[in-house]
Each structure stands twice: as C-alpha cells, then as structure tokens.
C-alpha cells in the first residue's frame, strides 16, 4: 500500500505532505487546513496542469473567508515547476490569511508575473526564505516578487540562487528588513555582493549574513557595505576562504561603527586579518588555523572573542585576551 | 514521556534582563510541536508569552514583543526565554509547555523582580 | 486578541452534584471541523492541567465525569458529578489564532 501523501501531527502543529506519485490526489492536503505550520513537497512536479483548473484572474476576495480560517503561519512549498501565473495567484489568495512566513525552495518558476492590480492587497509577510529557486525573468525577479508583498517584510534569505544579483532599479526599499542571508551562494563573490546589495534598498538591516559566499578578504566585504550604504549590526563571514592580507593597492575601508559582532569561524584563517573594525563586542575567530596566540596589536578591541578550534589551543589552557570565551575543549571544526 | 523543567535566576533587578532555560527531556524539540512560555503572576491569570517551533520559526505575543526573544539550543534539547526592562509587573512564575494545547507543563519557577 | 470571557467568576456545587462552567469568545475560534478551545484545571502550587481539548475531546487520564461542549464562540465544562478533588480554579483557552489566549478562571468550590 502506498504511504498517505500527508501527515498531520497530533496536535494539529505541523502538517507535512510529500506529493511524490505523477498524478497526486492534491485533495489530500486539506488535512492541512487546521495546521500552523505546513510543509508541501511536490516531487518535482510539473504545476502547468494546474493553470487549466483554476483562474489565475478569479478575484482572491471571494476565498477571503475561506482562508482566514486556516490557521496557517509558517508555509513550505518545495519541488515543483511553477509557472509564474499560478504562484501570483496563490500569494494573491494567501494574502487573506494569517501567514507569516514563507519558505520557497527546490523550485522553477515559468514565465513572467503579472503586474499588481491596483484593488489588490499584498501578502503581508514576515520572512521570506528562498533555496534554489530559479526564475524565467532573470534578475528582474525580485522586483516583480516584491511588489506581492506588503512593505513589512523583516527577514529575506536567498540561498542556490540562480541570479543572486538584482535589477536595483526596479526594486522598491525594504523599510523593515533587519535580516538579510545571501549564504550558500559560492558564486557571489565581493563583486556580486555590491551588485546584489542594491544601494539604499535595505536601510534597516541589522543582521547580514554571508556564510559561503565566495568571500575574499573582510576588507572587500567593508568596501561592498559601504557602496551600498549598508550597516549591520551583526555580520557573519564564516564558512568562507578568507585572505588575512589585504591588498595593498586597495583603499583602506573604515568600517561602520554600527558593526559589533563579526564571525569569521571556519574561514581557513592562519592569522588574525587586516583591516578588522577598530572596536567589537563580539569577534568569532573559531576553527581556523591560527597556529599562535593573536597578539593584543593584531586585534580590535574586543568584548567576547571565541577561539576555540584552533591548532594553537591545547584544551585547558587559558585565553590570552581578556573577556574570552573558551570552552577548554576543542570542538569538531 | 516529554519531560519539561525550568531553570534561572529567582530574583531579578528592576531594568535588568530576565534569563530562564527550559530542559526537555523524552522527547527532541525539532521533531515537531511549539515550545512556550507561559506565565503566571501571583493569585492572578495565565498569560502566553510565545513559542519557539520545532522550526525555528518564533511568535510572540504583541504586548509583550518588544521585549521578548525565545531562542534554543538544539544539542543541548533546550529552549531559553530572555525579557528585557523587567518591572515588579514581571513577577510571576513562568512555566515551559509543549504544544499549542497545553498538555505538558514544567513544574514552573517564580521569578521575583526586585531591588 | 480573542477575549475569553469564563462565567461564573466562581462557583459552589455540592458533592456528587453537577457543575457547569461557561466560555465566551469574542470572535469564533473554529478553524474548518475544529474548535480550538481548550480546558485546564489547576490546583495550588501545582501547573495547570489539559482536560479537555479542542472543545470536547478528553485528554489522556482525565476522569470521565469531565466533559466539554460548543462551537464557534460559545463553550461549556461540565462535570458531572462534582468529587471532593475536583477543587480548582478552571481556565478555557484558545488556541484558534494567535496571540493564544486564556479565560480569566473559575474557582469551582464545595457547597
């Protein structure tokens, strides 16, 4: 007997479905309706089909009832072609309900969205989390994704993409966007991180991270915020190959005075980098290769720094700066 | 079983931040469910303060939103509430609970705010 | 929010006899085939305790006397025939939308 395509929790939580055979029963996700969280999973399914059953240009208001009952905060939606006209559609319906937070991954998305109607609400999200989604549009698809949405979004995340790099000038500001994660796109790379960070698109960001992005040098990263007026308060580098040198026909970059955590853990590091932020609260220096102790003149001026992980520390022995962090033991780097 | 206990400090400083940590035992807090604080002044009602999911995903109640931040340790199995600026209206005992029907309750600690 | 509004504030039955406590939501807290109201007892010093959940359904090792009913906005407790442990301040909940929200409580007390 094949598996139920749907699983719901016992306490009406989470609700998972993973529609894996060629033709799915979809009426099996109604089990759904009274999940907070749901989690979807085409199977690499073709959606087209979809378009011929439903009217993409059906008014949304008359579902509004419907789906302000669903109780659903946190929605996955994973493996699929979806054509543009049927994603419109959806955040369109779903911009009745209490969804939160939206989660895209594993998808390709055909053909080009529509416009915004102007008697259309937005879908007023929280977070939004795409891995590995591709779009026919190119790098025009932000903007085209963005204007579905109302101005409140507080968290984006942008893994796999395809075009990482954004049409800045068909971009709206993101007013309340604190978080931004472009990690997990290798190809990035300091130069596709100032076409991405589009210059004055994102004033209010507070944490940035760019963990395995192709990073080069913190310095370069300084130079790419900095073009882009951009000034977090928090920022992960980690989990990139980093150089300790800087160039030294680079302009030097005077880091913003916003910034007061940096992580540069797992960046294959065999000395403290130049051109670090003069002054830290927080400095995350674990499982690199420093083969001695930094030196008081190699490093800003820290609260908490973290070198745990590294080959000059034998377990047990003190930290040699003052307000370390240190477990004692080496952790698996 | 799904076992819940809650540890901190029992008296904090008016204006300071107030630190509590729920240890779960029997059951893993990234399987599935919500992960609450509840609180309960002195003689009086129950409050929700918030979740953590099995996700990640966080929600807080609104009155209380600008002050609160749930986070977790998955390797540890535990789920912390911190609450900014605390005032006397803060005391309570504040209970860890599994789910959105509260069906698993830790004991509870009373936290006192006070100089 | 969803206010939950219990009635009575407290309440004295005699042993063996039947106790009913109402709850009222100020907007519905069904989602589709389910009402999301729950039902606590608590004791002092003690956390509170499920009885009931989404409306009428008995939790696990809940006596039977105990029993809920309701729809939409309007919610009872009954407990058939009031035993001497039965003792308690009783709290509906709501777990429809958030923020999840409690009633004000029932003292339920021995005539």
């Known amino acids: 007997t094949t598996p139920e395509p749907c699983e719901l929790d016992d306490e009406d939580f989470r609700c998972v479905c993973n529609f894996s055979e060629p033709q799915p029963d979809w009426s099996e996700a109604f089990q759904c309706v009274s999940a907070v969280e749901v989690e979807i999973h085409a199977g690499g399914l073709n959606l087209e089909p979809f378009l011929k059953r439903v009217d993409a240009d059906a008014d949304p208001r008359q579902y509004a009832d419907t789906v302000k009952a669903l109780r659903v905060r946190r929605l996955t939606v994973g493996a699929a072609q979806v054509p543009a006209q049927l994603l419109v559609g959806a955040l369109r319906v779903l911009a009745y309900s209490r969804l939160k937070e939206l989660t895209l991954e594993d998808l390709k998305i055909t053909g080009t969205m529509p416009p915004l109607p102007l008697e259309a609400t937005g879908l007023a999200l929280s977070s939004l989390r795409l891995r590995n989604v591709s779009w026919a549009t190119g790098r025009s698809w932000l903007a085209e994704l963005q204007q579905w949405l109302k101005p409140g979004l507080k968290v984006l995340s942008i893994a796999q993409a395809h075009s990482p790099a954004f049409s800045c000038e068909q971009v709206r500001a993101f007013p309340a966007l604190t978080s931004l994660d472009l990690s997990d796109n290798p190809g990035l790379g300091e130069r596709g991180l100032m076409a991405a960070l589009c210059p004055h698109k994102f004033p209010a960001i507070q944490n940035l991270a760019l963990r395995n992005t192709g990073m080069e040098t913190p310095t370069g990263v300084c130079a790419a915020l900095a073009a882009a007026g951009v000034q977090p308060h928090s920022l992960d580098l980690s989990h990139n190959s980093l150089r300790a040198t800087v160039n030294p026909s680079a302009p030097r970059c005077m880091w913003s005075s916003a910034l007061n955590s940096l992580n540069l853990s797992f960046a294959g590091l065999e000395q403290v980098p130049k051109g670090l932020p003069a002054k830290l609260r927080v400095l995350d220096l674990s499982c690199n290769r420093l083969n001695r102790a930094p030196q008081p003149d190699e490093l800003p001026e820290v609260d908490n720094l973290t070198l745990d992980g590294n080959p000059f520390l034998v377990p047990g022995t003190a930290l040699p700066h003052e307000g370390s962090m240190n477990s004692g033991v080496v952790p698996a780097c | 079983q799904v076992q819940l206990q809650e540890s901190g400090p029992g008296l904090v400083k008016p204006s300071q931040t107030l630190s509590l940590t729920c240890t779960v035992s029997g059951y893993s807090i990234t399987s599935d469910s919500a992960w609450n604080w509840i609180r309960q002044p002195p003689g009086k009602g129950l409050e929700w303060i918030g979740y953590i999911s099995y996700s990640g995903s966080t929600s807080y109640n609104p009155s209380l939103k600008s002050r609160v931040t749930i986070s977790r340790d998955t390797s540890k199995n535990q789920f912390s509430l911190k609450l900014s600026s605390v005032t006397a209206a803060d005391t309570a005992v504040y209970y860890c609970?599994?789910?959105?029907?509260?069906?698993?309750w830790g004991q509870g600690t009373l936290v006192t705010v006070s100089s | 929010d969803i206010v939950l509004t219990q009635s009575p504030d407290s309440l004295a039955v005699s042993l063996g006899e039947r106790a009913t406590i109402n709850c009222r939501a100020s907007?519905?807290?069904?989602?589709?085939?389910?009402?999301?109201l729950h039902w606590y007892q608590q004791k002092p010093g003690q956390p509170p305790k499920l009885l009931i959940y989404?409306?009428?359904n008995l939790q696990s090792g809940v006596p039977d006397r105990f029993s809920g009913s309701g729809s939409r906005t309007d919610f009872t407790l009954t407990i058939s025939s009031l035993q001497a442990e039965d003792v308690a301040v009783y709290y509906c909940?709501?777990?429809?939308?958030?923020?999840?929200?409690f009633g004000q409580g029932t003292k339920l007390e021995i005539k």
């Open positions: 989404r409306a009428s």
């Open positions: 609970v599994r789910g959105l029907r509260f069906a698993y």
């Open positions: 907007e519905s807290v069904d989602s589709y085939v389910n009402s999301f």
């Open positions: 909940q709501q777990s429809n939308e958030d923020p999840y929200t």
